[in-house]
């Protein structure tokens, strides 16, 4: 990018540059027309018969450098060929010299600084590539010369440019003074400011465009070259903030439209809101959940919104004495989540009718809550109690919902208490083929013992076909048809109106080897 400091083509008024010395044959200002018929100013000089050592100087007005360290001067000029000039002497030249002088203010006068090299700094002696030929009575013909010179380094507030003629017949058609700067550039969402290079290359720190944030790594920077070009180099740039996406060739961040979101900074575009969520404003980093829908704390910001599940279905209970097996079907609605668990709430009602939450004597296997399988075994039920179990399904957002948690209830009433296990079995008589047994009457909490069941089998014969049962209404029994000299394992259980109690411990007894021994009492 070029920034103009002076362009005589754009000057509509007299330039009125300073000439030295005040003699005939000096530089003179002329006006003409450019291609658009606009008035332009030029200077010409043609003192080809000048006195030896006589120079004609022309100095521009003071030009503020505006921070430029190097300034470029593009000269357009024509130069008359010395041979075309009939009165040209040996002093005729086809070159001129360019100088500059720096100052902090417009302090030059008609006589100062002294019109010579040092204090003026020589830039170059300019020779014409194209010479203009002029024949008497005919129009001059020849190309315009264009020369660009580089001034500097400059350090003061401004400068003057000066032209020294030592015998040329020439016209300075235009002067363009400019400096080069790197234009403002936006790349990778990073804005690099307009920069005037002060050296061969200058590092320039970038800043993120609006609604962008720095990417991890070093701060973005680019190099501005002396020629006003940005050095090509990968830029660790910026990325759009959450709720914004890159647009217009990675030069700006655009807010996500309504109904879309972008949860993280970085690359990527705005996405439609996930299920059961919405964004009513632009620039959303997260979509709000619909009423009744939630995100768990551990859910990503871009996750769909979910809802607690409905109640489990079809609870089936199987009561077995003091233990209960419950199982159920999964809820119809999972709420859109995979982290489904079940929990049970329990109330118990005594036979008299008073109810309360279940006591601590119940055990749940695998547990009363955080169940991942749809079943549980409850142990330690008390007889003749009514239990109400509420089975609820839960997921990761159940804790965020307000209002009652849906459940599936099941009522179970336990039987009255069965007699306790029968122990202390005694062998009252034994023979080679029979055993007479007796036991103490157990104390049945719910009514009298109605009868007993004796279960026995020969020791070593463990299969179900070898087990035999005998019922008796008395607290004694005779086992017949036994093997001579064999060992038998015996268990007894009692039955009341509440049902059978559990079998007692196995009792070990043995038949006689010989008849002649007779019956004899055996104590267990």
């Amino acid at each position: 990018l070029e920034e103009t400091l002076l362009n005589t083509k754009l000057e509509t008024a007299d330039l009125k540059w300073v000439t030295f010395p005040q003699v005939d044959g000096q530089w003179e200002e002329l006006s003409g027309l450019d291609e658009e018929q606009h008035s332009v100013r030029t200077y010409e000089v043609c003192d080809v018969q000048r006195a030896p050592g006589q120079a004609h100087w022309l100095r521009t007005g003071w030009v503020p450098r505006r921070g430029a360290v190097h300034v470029y001067a593009t000269l357009r000029f024509t130069m008359l060929e010395c041979l075309s000039l009939p009165r040209a002497g040996r002093s005729c030249k086809e070159t001129f010299t360019v100088f500059y002088y720096e100052s902090d203010a417009d302090t030059a006068t008609a006589l100062t600084p002294a019109w010579m090299e040092n204090p003026y700094i020589k830039v170059d002696t300019v020779a014409a590539e194209h010479l203009t030929r002029k024949r008497p009575g005919a129009e001059a013909t020849g190309k315009v010369n264009v020369k660009t010179l580089r001034l500097g380094p400059l350090s003061k507030a401004g400068f003057y440019l000066a032209f020294q003629d030592q015998g040329a017949c020439m016209a300075l058609l235009s002067l363009h003074l400019f400096y080069k700067k790197c234009a403002q550039l936006t790349v990778n969402l990073t804005r690099f400011p307009e920069t005037v290079p002060r050296e061969l290359v200058v590092p320039v720190a970038g800043s993120c465009v609006v609604d962008a944030v720095p990417a991890p790594g070093p701060s973005p920077s680019l190099y501005c070259r002396e020629d006003g070009q940005w050095a090509e180099q990968p830029v660790t740039g910026c990325s759009c903030a959450p709720g914004f996406e890159a647009a217009e060739g990675n030069t700006k961040c655009r807010a996500c439209a309504q109904g879309t979101f972008k949860p993280l900074s970085g690359e990527g575009s705005c996405q439609p809101c996930p299920a059961n969520s919405h964004s009513n404003t632009i620039g959303s980093a997260v979509c709000q959940c619909r009423v009744g829908y939630f995100r768990a704390r551990t859910d990503p910001r871009g996750a769909p919104c979910t809802t607690p599940p409905s109640a489990p279905r079809s609870v089936v209970s199987r009561l077995n004495g003091s233990s209960l097996h419950l199982e159920w079907s999964a809820p119809l609605e999972s709420g859109g989540r995979e982290d489904l668990t079940y929990a049970l709430r329990c109330r118990e009602c005594r036979p008299g009718g008073s109810c309360a939450p279940c006591g601590g004597d119940l055990t749940f296997d695998p547990g009363p809550r955080d169940l991942v399988e749809p079943w549980v075994v409850v142990r330690g039920l008390r007889p003749d109690f009514t239990y109400t179990f509420e089975v609820t399904a839960l997921n990761g957002v159940s804790s965020l919902a307000t209002g009652p948690v849906p459940f599936e209830p099941v009522n179970v009433t336990t039987d009255r208490e069965v007699p306790p296990a029968v122990s202390d079995i005694r062998v009252t008589r034994s023979s080679p083929s029979s055993l007479s047994l007796a036991w103490a009457v157990p104390r049945a909490p719910s009514g009298a013992v109605l009868d007993y069941e004796v279960k026995y089998h020969e020791k070593g014969a463990e299969g179900p076909s070898s087990v035999r049962f005998l019922k008796t209404s008395e607290n004694r029994a005779e086992l017949r048809g036994l093997k001579r000299g064999a060992s038998y394992l015996v268990q007894v259980r009692a039955r009341s109106e509440a049902g059978y109690g559990p079998f007692g411990q196995e009792h070990h007894s043995q038949t006689q080897l010989d008849e002649s021994e007779g019956w004899r009492e055996q104590l267990a």
Partner: antibody, heavy 126, light 108 residues
């Protein structure tokens, strides 16, 4: 001899037309930018119009724009001023004047008038 | 457009210095040229580019220009210098020229 000689002046009625001529001699006419300057009786000088060396650019004072036309015939070394819709206030001596010439580039001229004709009187009256 | 203002008349005794002013906004930034016109004659250029003298013009004629005022100075004024003097500069439009109202110099 370097000189400019105007002709074509005279008495003309308001609304009428007149064509002034200026014959140049003694210099390369086709390298010179030319102008017309007028002077009302007892008044000061007033620039009227200008034309560049090749004749393709013209410029006019606001007071005559649209009524006067400047032109030139370089083959005849002659400058013209065609005056139409003349008014009483156009009554003046009309001078043909040369702008200072470039050494060799007829695209440019100096801003002063370095050569004048003797003038021709135009009287607009009924 | 720029307006150039001159005093209608200036009087000077022979041999004295006559100064004729020409004023206008920021006139010092423009080149000013001066013309002499004697009765019944065409104008003659006496000073151009503020202070340059054409060949044939006596050295007693000089010019200056700064600020808002340009000045034509005739030192050692002679009777033959009695005439009307006009200043001229660029106008605002493209290649339009402006003249001052003129000053009648009387040599007493």
């Amino acid at each position: 001899q370097v000189q400019l000689v105007e002709s074509g002046g005279g008495l003309v009625q308001p609304g009428g037309s007149l064509r002034l001529s200026c014959a140049a001699s003694g210099f390369t006419f086709n390298n010179a930018w030319m102008s017309w300057v007028r002077q009302a009786p007892g008044k000061g000088l007033e620039w009227v119009s200008a034309i560049n060396a090749k004749g393709q650019f013209t410029s006019y004072a606001d007071s005559v724009k649209g009524r006067f036309t400047i032109s030139r015939d370089n083959s005849k070394n002659t400058l013209y001023l065609q005056m139409n819709s003349l008014r009483a206030e156009d009554t003046a001596v009309y001078y043909c004047a040369r702008k200072g010439m470039s050494f060799y580039n007829n695209k440019y001229a100096k801003s002063m008038f370095d050569l004048w004709g003797q003038g021709t009187l135009v009287t607009v009256s009924s | 457009d720029i307006e150039l203002t001159q005093p209608p008349s200036v009087s000077v005794a022979p041999g004295q210095t006559a100064r004729i002013s020409c004023s206008g906004d920021n006139l010092g930034k423009k080149y000013v040229h001066w013309y002499q016109q004697k009765p019944g004659q065409a104008p003659v250029l006496v000073i151009y580019y503020d202070s340059k003298r054409p060949s044939g013009i006596p050295e007693r004629f000089s010019g200056s220009n700064s600020g808002n005022t340009a000045t034509l100075t005739i030192s050692g004024t002679q009777a033959e210098d009695e005439a009307d003097y006009y200043c001229q500069a660029w106008g605002a439009g493209s290649h339009q020229m402006v003249f001052g109202g003129g000053t009648k110099l009387t040599v007493l």
